[in-house]
């Protein structure tokens, strides 16, 4: 279920969820539907200061790189 994740524990969880894709601490600019003027919220704020779930963690994974064509 949802839980708070801080420090190295949060990094470990992100590495597990995102794997080789890597992850962002902040959502890239223009990510999602939030207003441009809204303060930037990062994974720390969303998962250390309140409970978050797997879906929330996945939002901070870097996008999959397209496979190179042969």
């Amino acid at each position: 279920g949802p839980e708070t994740l801080c420090g190295a524990e949060l990094v470990d969880a992100l590495q597990f969820v995102c794997g080789d894709r890597g992850f962002y601490f902040n959502k890239p600019t223009g990510y999602g539907s939030s207003s441009r003027r809204a303060p930037q919220t990062g994974i720390v704020d969303e998962c250390c200061f309140r409970s978050c779930d797997l879906r929330r963690l996945e939002m901070y994974c870097a996008p999959l790189k397209p496979a190179k064509s042969a």
Partner: antibody, heavy 119, light 112 residues
Framework: QVQLQESGPGLVKPSETLSLTCTVS????????WSWIRQPPGRGLEWIGY???????NYNPSLKSRVTMSVDTSKNQFSLKLSSVTAADTAVYYC?????????????WGQGATVTVSS | QSVLTQAPSVSGAPGQRVTISCTGR?????????VHWYQQFPGTAPKLLIY???NRPSGVPDRFSGSKSGTSASLAITGLQAEDEADYYC???????????FGGGTKLTVLG
């Protein structure tokens, strides 16, 4: 058990930059979140900002333009710089740690460093 | 003016129960962000008293308890003792400010 110790000049002139260092013992600086908080004389606590060693930072919007936080993992230290200080920046400055076992609560604090801004 | 509102002072006689409230809004406590409570004696650093709304760190007596409901939180102290006389601060995260926020603090006086 993580322990924190603030150090730096106790007196800073107006318009200059306040610099403080927090030395961490008993734990790795790369494992936790680190924070600075201040308390003006006779007043309440004010959050200055926090950061993770990877470079993730978050500063109080009211201080953001003047604040820089950095980390030296080799010395297990992190620092605070506050530029263009005025008398309103006179306060006890605390470094604190969020170890992750307390749901974001700051569970370890330094003893505080008193900084006076005066010419 | 603090984002989290606390009464400036509260008092009680030894053995009594007192509560200290912390009122926020929909961008902090009401948004599901955890509330933490700190105890501070004069001339010393704050100490974490309650974390994650209602959890006590080891070493904190069970006379101290925390709760949260809607946009506010409360710290309750039962069996009040003289050594409980201190300042108490609540803290949470505010999404509209994108940062942590403290209450203005409540000074607890134990009548005696």
């Amino acid at each position: 058990q993580v322990q924190l110790q603030e150090s730096g000049p106790g007196l800073v002139k107006p318009s200059e930059t306040l610099s403080l260092t927090c030395t961490v013992s008993g734990g790795s600086i790369s494992s936790y979140y680190w924070s600075w908080i201040r308390q003006p004389p006779g007043r309440g606590l004010e959050w200055i900002g926090y950061f993770f060693y990877s470079g993730y930072t978050n500063y109080n919007p009211s201080l953001k333009s003047r604040v820089t936080m950095s980390v030296d993992t080799s010395k297990n230290q992190f620092s605070l710089k506050l530029s263009s200080v005025t008398a309103a920046d006179t306060a006890v400055y605390y470094c604190a740690c969020i170890t992750g076992t307390t749901k974001g609560g700051m569970d370890v604090w330094g003893q505080g460093a008193t900084v006076t801004v005066s010419s | 003016q603090s984002v989290l509102t606390q009464a400036p002072s509260v008092s009680g006689a030894p053995g009594q129960r007192v509560t200290i409230s912390c009122t926020g809004r929909s961008s902090n406590i009401g948004a599901g962000y955890d509330v933490h409570w700190y105890q501070q004696f004069p001339g010393t650093a704050p100490k974490l008293l309650i974390y994650g709304n209602s959890n006590r760190p080891s070493g904190v007596p069970d006379r101290f308890s925390g709760s949260k409901s809607g946009t506010s939180a409360s710290l309750a102290i039962t069996g009040l003792q003289a050594e409980d006389e201190a300042d108490y601060y609540c803290q949470s995260y505010d999404s509209s400010l994108s940062g942590s926020v403290f209450g203005g603090g409540t000074k607890l006086t134990v009548l005696g």
